[in-house]
Interface confidence: low
């Protein structure tokens, strides 16, 4: 399926609007510090060039690869060296090394100011004045802060962003209409970014075999009536899509994703009865809907797995003849029967099964050796079940904020070398598992909780990779993708850690505390809590609770005072002294 001009091919397939949006996202994800206007200029130049190639595919440079065209364009940025330092050295390389070099310089935690939301009237005026620029700005701002955001999905978010403004800027109460929609888009967007980051980490750090295994398990849960050959085809196609997006090949990725959605909708009968409502929607919405579709009902009377995978005398023969396919079928058969298991647990079971076959198929009596393999699964299943049960009980007892605090203490004691902002961000997100999953029925709790925790812990891993400070974090992040969560769960208090010296400045607060939003106040208090634990890692729960209660009382008192700043100046040192005494 070769084309004379790749850029013309993609322009025709995607259409001008999506083409321009995707090129803007690609450039913004690579050059995260460049001003908006610079990116718009580059995108317009690429688009004009693409149009000349559509008119004549034989025109000069139209036969060049997209990486060559886009890389050449990025390397024309005048301030590359002063803005990005050594990233400018990428431009001295040839493709494909140049693109690999750009990919390696993507920054998961760019030093960009937090996005401030203007007044609703200001946003509506900007939207009406120049809708196209307003939406491009959204794509640019999200893409540069989330360099692995799933590009075709970002176009879907932008379409929803546009729809929200189109509707709400005409409403009687613009703010009441718009703000909840923007909050929802922000929260969903952050979740989508984190989920995609795990897919890219899986592909880049553990290879496409790891991603394919994940996809077999997840798609088998979603489509338990589909046969293995069908699931395998979807997995192959999905792997190609995500490999492309994670590799910066956003045009190919979006094009292939559209093809996959088309295939799924044309073959609903052999995939799932749940696809119908997705398939009537327009492209971006359809692809999103298919990705989020609920699990189909399990076929009735599925026979026991034991017959083919334990009792059969041919297990070792089948395994030897086609290891990955046989293990893939095992994973498919297990996953379609267990929508109540997390994908990560299913992958652990497949790994355990593989390890047993590796050992037993070399034994004198293989059948006797692997006869009890399913019994060995029990502890692997019970571990996440118990973890979810215990943590949901704790969440129900404490509520979200205090549950987050419990996790902050737990994780700071495990890995106190990690930076305080990272510990706060990750623990706050770990704590959100309660509200997200604990309200669900028993059968949905584990897949919700453990697969969400995998996404959050991946964020810890990518941030830690940028500035490694803890051997324990490196070990948990790199040894096994499927065992990351159990690895972190198993970490104990780091006995080798030398407590941080007490710094009064860290615990000095001012009247600006009083004007912060509730969320910002929580972050301030949680930052102080992490610092306390770093100072006194062996402090008991009761000691830390006492200090935090005093802190809340001190802030509340000063925020009610007439002269707030004077109160903070007077009461602050008293709080610090009392805290030190309480933790002595």
């Amino acid at each position: 399926d070769t084309h004379k001009s790749e850029v013309a091919h993609r322009f025709k397939d995607l259409g001008e609007e999506h083409f321009k949006g995707l090129v803007l996202v690609a450039f913004s994800q690579y050059l995260q510090q460049c001003p908006f206007e610079e990116h718009v200029k580059l995108v317009n130049e690429v688009t004009e060039f693409a149009k000349t190639c559509v008119a004549d595919e034989s025109a000069e440079n139209c036969d060049k690869s997209l990486h060559t065209l886009f890389g050449d364009k990025l390397c024309t940025v005048a301030t590359l060296r002063e803005t990005y330092g050594e990233m400018a050295d990428c431009c001295a390389k040839q493709e494909p090394e140049r693109n690999e070099c750009f990919l390696q310089h993507k920054d998961d935690n760019p030093n960009l100011p937090p996005l401030v939301r203007p007044e609703v009237d200001v946003m509506c005026t900007a939207f009406h004045d120049n809708e196209a620029t307003f939406l491009k700005k959204y794509l640019y701002e999200v893409a540069r802060r989330h360099p692995y955001f799933y590009a075709p999905e970002l176009l879907f978010f932008a379409a929803r962003y546009k729809a929200a403004f189109a509707e709400c800027c005409q409403a009687a109460d613009k703010a009441a209409c718009l703000l909840p929609k923007l909050d929802e888009l922000r929260d969903e967007g952050k979740a989508s970014s984190a989920k995609q980051r795990l897919k890219c980490a899986s592909l880049q750090k553990f290879g496409d075999r790891a991603f394919k295994a994940w996809a077999v398990a997840r798609l088998s849960q979603k489509f338990p009536k589909a046969e293995f050959a069908e699931v395998s085809k979807l997995v192959t196609d999905l792997t190609k899509v995500h490999t492309e997006c994670c590799h910066g090949d956003l045009l190919e990725c979006a094009d292939d994703r559209a093809d996959l959605a088309k295939y799924m909708c044309e073959n609903q009968d052999s995939i799932s009865s749940k696809l119908k409502e997705c398939c009537d929607k327009p492209l971006l919405e359809k692809s999103h809907c298919l990705a989020e579709v609920e699990n189909d009902e399990m076929p009735a009377d599925l026979p026991s797995l034991a017959a083919d995978y334990v009792e059969s005398k041919d297990v070792c023969k089948n395994y030897a003849e086609a290891k990955d396919v046989f293990l893939g079928m095992f994973l498919y058969e297990y996953a379609r029967r267990h929508p109540d298991y997390s994908v990560m647990l299913l992958l652990r079971l497949a790994k355990a099964y593989e390890a047993t076959l590796e050992k037993c198929c070399a034994a004198a009596d293989p059948h006797e050796c692997y006869a009890k393999v399913f019994d060995e699964f029990q502890p692997l299943v019970e571990e996440p079940q118990n973890l979810v049960k215990q943590n949901c009980e704790l969440f129900e007892q404490l509520g979200e904020y205090k549950f987050q605090n419990a996790l902050l203490v737990r994780y700071t004691k495990k890995v106190p070398q990690v930076s305080t902002p990272t510990l706060v961000e990750v623990s706050r997100n770990l704590g959100k598992v309660g509200a997200k999953c604990c309200k669900l029925p028993e059968a949905k709790r584990m897949p919700c909780a453990e697969d969400y925790l995998s996404v959050v812990l991946n964020r810890l891993c990518v941030l830690h990779e940028k500035t490694p400070v803890s051997e324990k974090v490196t070990k948990c992040c790199t040894e096994s993708l499927v065992n990351r969560r159990p690895c972190f769960s198993a970490l104990e208090l780091d006995e080798a850690y030398v407590p941080k010296a007490f710094n009064a400045e860290t615990f000095t607060f001012h009247a600006d505390m009083c004007t912060l939003s509730e969320k910002e106040k929580q972050v301030k208090k949680q930052t102080a809590l992490v610092e306390l634990v770093k100072h006194k890692p062996k402090a008991t729960k009761e000691q830390l609770k006492g200090v935090m209660d005093n802190f809340a009382a001190f802030v509340e008192k000063c925020c009610k005072a007439d002269d707030k700043e004077a109160c903070f100046a007077e009461e602050g040192p008293k709080f610090v002294a009392a805290s030190q005494a309480a933790l002595a």
Partner: nanobody, 115 residues
Framework: QVQLVESGGGLVQPGGSLRLSCAAS????????MSWVRQAPGKGPEWVSA????????RYAESVKGRFTISRDNAKKTLYLQMNSLKPEDTAVYYC????????GSQGTQVTVSS
């Protein structure tokens, strides 16, 4: 690309016999258990019979036990279903699947039992 092509269906009187074949390609046929599944008009798929990769272990749904026989020829990459003492309630589209799936991934072959 995995392909399964069934043949051998047709119209037969009650009590009669038919032999269905399923030709496989695109995967290591000899490494996988296989099943026959059927779908009667207006009904969901029903698992009929399964055979392990080597052909030694066979299993049947209660409704066909003693009347149907599943077999395979790994050299020819073909799965068979010998159907004897056919009844009107055996009327359905029959299709073969890899493993124990009851999802229809191929066209199937129509079997009609009627006098």
């Amino acid at each position: 690309q995995v392909q399964l092509v069934e043949s051998g269906g047709g119209l037969v009187q009650p009590g009669g016999s038919l032999r269905l074949s399923c030709a496989a390609s695109g995967f290591t046929f000899g490494s996988f258990g296989m099943s026959w599944v059927r779908q009667a008009p207006g009904k969901g798929p029903e698992w009929v019979s399964a055979i392990d990769s080597g052909g030694a272990d066979t299993r049947y749904a209660e409704s066909v036990k003693g009347r149907f026989t599943i077999s395979r020829d790994n050299a020819k990459k073909t799965l068979y279903l010998q159907m004897n003492s056919l009844k009107p309630e055996d009327t359905a589209v029959y299709y073969c699947t890899i493993g124990q799936s009851t999802s229809r991934g191929s066209q199937g072959t129509q079997v009609t039992v009627s006098s």
